[in-house]
């Protein structure tokens, strides 16, 4: 995790000012709205799940 | 400090029901999607439940064989996320664990509780 | 629903030597991008708890000794050089699609 203004997320993931964290990228396949996903710079998520 | 805290469990009788309870601390409760995750000698670890945040309009999912018989719900405003289990059989005793996962693998754990169907 | 194959289903591995666990889909669980695969420890006594997630993105206060690798339907985990507290069951757990599945689990044992 991080603070507001320190170094970057790791690769693959995201600062989230919602949960006040570093969020995988990953995880926007799941849950495409939140907010972190924004700052992930990676393909266009697949289809979801359900 | 993150934490997940069970109650709940116990000795049933087939047929009977129970309602198991996790209380969390630590995280921001009300964005994590929560699950029920249970384990036996027989069938490994099995999820059972999950119930999604409020921005997922609470959507529930079951496994095929709990579905109609347990039910999963969250109180944001107290932290805390239930199953109901209903019509329990012999086959639904093992440990039952509560846990969080913000989207796809599940991060923190409650302690489990022993749930037993036996007569 | 997806089957996850773990093998072996135990192992014994000398002190400082490579414990390789192995883990397959019976369908892929990858996007060009990530894999919806992770790995947990469990000890007896306690939950599972995470190691690797998304194959190969060790998780936050997991020793470097641990990797994960893999794509499509097989995957590995590597714990390199194991140590006496790497006695533990090891589980893949996939999160593809709905119902998540667990792999049976591989039961580590230091020689």
């Known amino acids: 995790e991080q603070a507001p203004g320190t170094a970057p997320c790791s690769r693959g993931s995201s600062w989230s000012a919602d949960l006040d964290a570093c969020m995988d990228c990953a995880s926007c396949r799941a849950r495409p709205h939140s907010d972190f996903c924004l700052g992930c710079a990676a393909a266009p998520p697949a289809p979801f799940r359900l | 400090q993150v934490q997940l805290q069970q109650s709940g469990g116990g000795l049933v009788q087939p047929g009977g029901s129970m309602k198991l309870s996790c209380i969390a601390s630590g995280f921001t409760f009300s964005s994590y999607w929560m699950s029920w995750v249970r384990q036996s000698p027989e069938k490994g670890l099995e999820w059972v439940a999950e119930?999604?945040?409020?921005?997922?309009?609470?959507?529930?999912h079951y496994a095929e064989s709990v579905k109609g018989k347990f039910t999963i719900s969250r109180d944001d405003s107290k932290s805390r996320f239930f199953l109901q289990m209903n019509n329990l059989r012999a086959e639904d005793t093992g440990i039952y664990y509560c846990?969080?996962?913000?989207?796809?693998?599940?991060?923190?754990w409650g302690q489990g509780t022993d749930l037993t169907v036996s007569s | 629903d997806i089957v996850m194959t773990q093998t072996p289903a135990s192992l014994a591995v000398s002190l400082g030597q490579r414990a390789t666990i192995s883990c397959r889909a019976s369908q892929s669980v990858s996007t060009s991008t990530y894999s919806y695969m992770h790995w947990y420890q469990q000890k007896p006594g306690q939950p599972p708890k995470l190691l690797i997630k998304?194959?190969?993105s060790l998780e936050s206060g997991v020793p470097a000794r641990f990797s994960g690798s893999g794509s499509g339907t097989d995957f590995t985990l590597n714990i390199h050089p194991v140590e006496e507290d790497d006695t533990a069951t090891y589980y893949c757990?996939?999160?593809?699609?709905?119902?998540?599945?667990f792999g049976g689990g591989t039961k580590l044992e230091i020689k």
């Open positions: 846990s969080s996962t913000y989207a796809d693998y599940f991060h923190y």
């Open positions: 119930i999604r945040s409020k921005s997922d309009n609470y959507a529930t």
């Open positions: 998304y194959a190969s």
């Open positions: 757990q996939h999160s593809w699609e709905i119902p998540y599945t």
